[in-house]
Interface confidence: low
Amino acid sequence: CRTSECCFQDPPYSDADSGSASGPRDLSCYRISSAGYECSWQYEGPTAGVSHFLRCCLSSGRCCYFATGSATRLQFSDQAGVSVLHTVTLWVESWARNRTEKSPEVTLQLYKSVKYKPPLGDIKVSKLAGQLRMEWETPDNQVGAEVQFRHRTPSSSWKLGDCGPQDDDTESCLCPLEMNVAQEFQLRRRRLGSQGSSWSKWSSPVCVPPENPPQPQVRFSVEQLGRDGRRRLTLKEQPTQLELPEGCQGPAPGVEVTYQLQLHMLSCPCKAKATRTLPLEKMPYLSGAAYNVAVISSNRFGPGPNQTWHIPADTHTEPVALNISVGTNGTTMYWPARAQSTTYCIEWQPVGQEGSLATCNLTAPQDPDPAGMATYSWSRESGAMGQEKCYHITIFASAHPKKLTLWSTVLSTYHFGGNASAAGTPHHVSVKNHSLDSVSVDWAPSLLSTCPGVLKEYVVRCRDEDSNQVSEHPVQPTETQVTLSDLRAGVAYTVQVRADTAWLRGAWSQPQRFSIKVQVSD
């Protein structure tokens, strides 16, 4: 027989034994051109000294064989004696060491047995009822296919699954979706309704992230507020990278987890924009305001869980940077101005009410005045900081107020509102004998002492009612007691206390009369 033809004779060996675990398997035959055909198969077991024979039986019952030697692939033409338009049954017999092993049979019509292509191009991946749905365009002229998938995770080997019959211009497959691990999928196709036809090659990997993007395990630290009123937010711990299956390592699209930073500036609620989302790689500078920072992880299925941190406001205060002048028409604040055309946000809140919303005002963009100061004024009728209590004032500045990450802190300080002069007057002034010529004067702390940095000092005034001589004694703002010495017995004195701020002299307390009794010796 000629090697290019199917030999219609008995093969040169005895009958096959199909009970062996080793031997030929996965036979597939298909048309490769208008008149050319190919059969190929796998061989399981030691290959030394093995000869392969492709057997073929026609529908008439006549059988022939091709001897391929050690090759497991054979090409032949439609002139080789094998009917290509009618059904034929094919199998492989492999002969070695005086025994023959047989593959399962395939029955097909060779002319119609086209080598199918795997899904090509863009495979769309979506979620459907808790499962994974893949969809792709059917390769040209290959409508009508059976489709299989195989999938693996980083820690598992390939598992096979069926997509079922497809009969349309687009094909699709429902596959299991893993909650917490990435998967690699590959798909293959074969002609529908011809069990003997061969499978296509596997498609390129389709990399699928877990349904839940991983919880972003990150830690932040915030630097000290710089002289420019900004502090850098830095990432102390990068998010853990998702473990990927073998075929998804490298630049495999579809499995990426992206992390975004969502910044919410809690201070200054009257500004235009309170929230900004930016990539995690772009760590921003922040003002000294309080912020909530969330890290949001997302993959091709959408956002996953987020982790939120609270960044407290920078509490460092500068008592001298703010001047407040109270006039008949209202109150004006002055502070060192920033660049031309800067918008300021002035925020105030009664101390002890930090949970409640602060009041704030946004200025129009303003340039420094001739003294290099910026100002903000309000009338008495507005009621702003009108109550006699301590207010925490923070001023923020930005040349681009709509850009959340470009705000900076100008100053943070405290101010006592209302009529601070009267409200700050010390009460409960009491005088106790200390010695023969001295007394101890005590008083209740001024309301101004509740306001950090506002109370500059107490002044105690003592007047000798006989001579009208007056002496004044400055007292540290943390003290509420002073000893007056060198007093004369029998003389009437009055004592008063006042509380002063840096810009305001306090009102004297009610005069308190006292005298030191003359000691009568026996």
Epitope: L128, A129, R133, E135, G161, D162, C163, G164, P165, S172, C173, L174, P176
Partner: nanobody, 119 residues
Framework: EVQLVESGGGLVQPGGSLRLFCAAS????????MGWYRQAPGKQREWLAS???????FYADSVKDRFTISRDSVKNTVYLQMNSLKPEDTAAYYC?????????????WGQGTLVTVSS
């Protein structure tokens, strides 16, 4: 063409159980995925559960942990075991070939079997 006949429905009290049967007129051995569906009066038909020829099962959130789908390819039957039934499970139940696009089925719908959950 495969004919599908559903049975096993009936009246059951809340918290009770039922087992539904779907008998196919010919072999379902090579049918890749079979599914159970239901349709309540005035509502759209919804997918409940599906099973592959390899035995992998999938469930809608509304029935997860309460319903169990299984198949016997020798008897050409698909089952739906329903536990902890609720009044909102009242509907006509159908089985059919499950496709990638739910409710685009290959075979005509059967008559269904009516399940009523009421005290």
């Amino acid at each position: 063409e495969v004919q599908l006949v559903e049975s096993g429905g009936g009246l059951v009290q809340p918290g009770g159980s039922l087992r539904l049967f779907c008998a196919a007129s010919r072999s379902i051995f090579n049918i890749n995925i079979m599914g159970w569906y239901r349709q309540a009066p005035g509502k759209q038909r919804e997918w409940l559960a599906s099973i592959t020829s390899g035995g992998s099962t999938f469930y809608a959130d509304s029935v997860k942990d309460r319903f169990t789908i299984s198949r016997d390819s020798v008897k050409n039957t698909v089952y739906l075991q329903m536990n902890s039934l609720k009044p909102e499970d009242t509907a006509a139940y159908y089985c059919n070939r499950y496709r990638s696009v739910p409710l685009n089925t290959v075979y005509p719908w059967g008559q269904g079997t009516l399940v009523t959950v009421s005290s």
